[in-house]
């Protein structure tokens, strides 16, 4: 038994960290391998972490952190029984990867303004909180060229855009996700999207 | 009521051996790392050695490598401290201490929060 | 090994007055935000030492709020805002990011 492909790995900056690698063969990965990791600091003690199957020869193991803070770095062992298949480190803030923002919502009553806001996926006291920035996907379902990406690269969870700028009388789709330059984060998974009608008073035009 | 209660200290010549205990009691005792500190006559504090929870992660003040161990056993609630090869210079009150929450991935840390009530080590021929 | 640097090493104080201790660090005890790994221990007359003040700022269970602990990186500080009799005896800070754990040389407080 063999790792054809390391083990990578991105944190969520708040309690879990992913790790997903490749074996060389069809692994039953959480009977047969065992993912040890451990932080370096002083009196720490190493921690299980049972992987899941992710495709034939394909692992993943998700492993539960207190938090994270820039200093942390933790050593990883990857066990088959007693065989060392695999030794490497990971620090966290290095390889972040945020949580997805919730509760898209669509609010389509402020006169011909489409308000659409949405929850930071972090708690205040966590420091992503304030380091967010935002891409809003936008798109027709009835229309495939018809998408646009928003950026918000201010702090706050919503984007304001007038409903004229969109097709009136068809429906749209719009999902979120989020970043953080400070890490130099990748972008989390897009969020669930949210469906709505889009109509507005066409204004009268005057010849 | 947490408590930590040492044992076993003595009057022993240089070059034996003396194995000190420290019972403990009141908290959840395999969860938290421990520590041994030692105060010659007279002097202040010196650390002397540490021991995760699990028995896993051991450290040594340097004046005492090679010739003392720190062990524990969780089943009993006890720590103890395997002191051979002594020498005058070990003559001290030793005292076992609560140290971090060590289960936890990162060891959780509220200070050395109780201590016993020290065991009298003499090294003299 | 991280030396802790104490002052004074003798403290004379009238009760009802402020006292103010200092500690210095070799190197940096900050692991990460609001985790200086430095505790205060007050050790009294034929007595085990007891924990007063943890991780720099944070005042351990049972400890009196007229001490109180503060600084980062390399330099604390323990004060008693009004000294009383019972405060005294030997004041000891301790490293605890790394071992060996070290400790100051001790500040003896007493009362004038």
């Known amino acids: 038994m063999k790792v054809l492909q390391e083990p990578t790995c991105v944190s969520d900056y708040m309690s879990i960290s992913t790790c997903e690698w490749k074996m060389n063969g069809p692994t039953n990965c959480s009977t047969e391998l065992r993912l040890l990791y451990q932080l370096v600091f002083l009196l720490s003690e190493a921690h299980t972490c049972i992987p899941e199957n992710n495709g034939g020869a394909g692992c993943v193991c998700h492993l539960l952190m207190d938090d994270v803070v820039s200093a942390d770095n933790y050593t990883l062992d990857l066990w088959a029984g007693q065989q060392l298949l695999w030794k490497g480190s990971f620090k966290p803030s290095e390889h972040v990867k945020p949580r997805a923002p919730g509760n898209l919502t669509v609010h389509t009553n402020v006169s011909d303004t489409l308000l659409l806001t949405w929850s930071n996926p972090y708690p205040p006291d966590n420091y992503l909180y304030n380091h967010l920035t935002y891409a809003v996907n936008i798109w027709s379902e009835n229309d495939p060229a018809d998408f646009r990406i928003y950026n918000v690269t201010y702090l706050e969870p919503s984007l304001r855009i007038a409903a004229s700028t969109l097709k009136s009388g068809i429906s749209y789709r719009a999902r979120v996700r989020a970043w953080a330059q400070c890490y130099n984060t990748t972008w989390s998974e897009w969020s669930p999207s949210t469906k709505w009608h889009n109509s507005y008073r066409e204004p009268f035009e005057q010849h | 009521e947490v408590q930590l209660v040492e044992s076993g200290g003595g009057l022993e010549q240089p070059g034996g051996s003396l194995r000190l205990s420290c019972a403990g009691s009141?908290?959840?005792?395999?969860?938290?790392?421990m520590t041994w500190v030692r105060q010659a006559p007279g002097k202040g504090l010196e650390w002397v050695s540490s021991i995760s929870g699990s028995g896993d992660n051991i450290y040594y003040a340097d004046s005492v490598k090679g010739r003392f161990t720190i062990s524990r056993d969780n089943s009993k609630n006890t720590l103890y401290l395997q002191m051979n090869s002594l020498r005058a210079e070990d003559t001290a009150v030793y005292y076992c201490a609560k140290d971090r929450l060590s289960k936890t991935i990162r060891p959780r840390y509220y200070g050395l929060d109780v201590w016993g009530q020290g065991t009298t080590v003499t090294v003299s021929s | 090994d991280i030396v802790m640097t104490q002052s004074p090493l003798s403290l004379p104080v009238t009760p009802g007055e402020p006292a103010s201790i200092s500690c210095r660090s070799s190197?940096?005890?900050?692991?990460?935000?609001?985790?200086?790994?430095v505790d205060w221990y007050l050790q009294k007359s034929g007595q085990s030492p007891q924990l007063l003040i943890y991780l720099g700022n944070k005042r351990a269970s049972g400890v009196p709020d007229r001490f109180s602990g503060s600084g980062s990186g390399t330099d604390f500080t323990l004060k008693i805002s009004r000294v009383e009799a019972e405060d005294v005896g030997f004041y000891y800070c301790m490293q605890a990011l790394d071992t060996p754990y070290t400790f100051g040389q001790g500040t003896k407080l007493e009362i004038k």
């Open positions: 190197q940096g005890l900050l692991y990460s935000i609001g985790y200086n790994y």
């Open positions: 009141g908290f959840t005792f395999r969860d938290f790392a």
